[in-house]
């Protein structure tokens, strides 16, 4: 990974584009920390394992988060 000690936040750009929950391999929510003072959301896609930084403020992404958490709560006993 192209990382050095000087890199503070993971996302160079963020996307507002809606993501189909079915095409998601993984959704990571990285809370704000001493290294990066903002929340970062990283989606890993099933296709080629592409990772995409999502805009936490986007309505489409907020809806995605709701859909994913709903799906998780259905699965957990």
């Amino acid at each position: 990974v192209p990382l050095s000690r000087t890199v503070r936040c993971t996302c160079i750009s963020i996307s507002n584009q809606p993501v189909n929950p079915r095409s998601l391999e993984k959704l990571e929510i990285i809370p704000a920390s001493q290294f990066c003072p903002r929340v970062e959301i990283i989606a890993t896609m099933k296709k080629k394992g592409e990772k995409r930084c999502l805009n936490p403020e986007s309505k489409a992404i907020k809806n995605l988060l709701k859909a994913v958490s709903k799906e998780r709560s259905k699965r957990s006993p």
Partner: antibody, heavy 124, light 109 residues
């Protein structure tokens, strides 16, 4: 459509300063990292600097470190390159380029929108 | 620092022929971090391929990218008149920096 327009180039003497601007339209500028890339006459492309979408990180090629500063004003949809202590070898066409949507340190989507460039000539 | 080498320097071909352009890295590069660009005289570069093999928006399917590790390839299956240009590979590396190769010129034979 998505567009980037550079300005501020010109002829300048060695040791002097210049500020380039790049104005964006047709996309949400505040969502995208931005780059400056240059091309000396008859030569290939050389990456100069990058700034994260929110200005959180800035990085430079070694040859301009300490002389050039990349910055942005998201309220004005504008990217800047402040160039100090200019040298003859800085003579080039300077392009601004948009970092692809969703790029991060784990996956790179390339520079997907480019301006037409502004020419900087450093000569005495 | 990773150095990219492109070969050949110039490729002389005719429309309809297949073009195979090579990009070699001095150290292993993740395919997630490799891109290809096209530049025509007097124009800005244009993104063709990202992630070593994914076509950028609007790029015709005659352009394809492949490779991994230190060896990457851009293939143009059938050259169209508008494809005669200079092609650059580029990698995103540590620090982070974004390095371009020296370019391959595809010209009319």
């Amino acid at each position: 459509q998505m567009q980037l327009v550079e300005s501020g180039g010109g002829v300048v003497q060695p040791g002097r300063s210049l500020r380039l601007s790049c104005t964006a339209s047709g996309f949400t500028f505040s969502n995208n990292g931005m780059h400056w890339v240059r091309q000396a006459p008859g030569k290939g492309l050389e990456w100069v600097a990058v700034i994260w979408f929110d200005g959180m990180n800035k990085f430079y090629v070694d040859s301009v470190k300490g002389r050039f500063t990349i910055s942005r004003d998201n309220s004005k949809n504008t990217l800047y390159l402040e160039m100090n202590s200019l040298r003859a070898e800085d003579t080039a066409i300077y392009y601004c380029a948009r970092e692809g949507d969703g790029s991060g340190i784990y996956y790179y989507y390339g520079m997907d929108v480019w301006g037409q460039g502004t020419t900087v000539t450093v000569s005495s | 620092e990773i150095v990219l080498t492109q070969s050949p320097g110039t490729l002389s071909l005719s429309p309809g022929e297949r073009a195979t352009l090579s990009c070699r890295a001095s150290q292993s590069v993740s395919s997630s971090y490799l891109a290809w660009y096209q530049q025509k005289p007097g124009q800005a570069p244009r993104l063709l391929i990202y992630g070593a093999s994914s076509r950028a928006t609007g790029i015709p399917d005659r352009f394809s990218g492949s490779g991994s590790g230190t060896d990457f390839t851009l293939t143009i299956s059938r050259l169209e008149p508008e494809d005669f240009a200079v092609y650059y590979c580029q990698q995103y590396g540590s620090s982070p920096i974004f390095t371009f190769g020296p370019g391959t010129k595809v010209d009319l034979s």
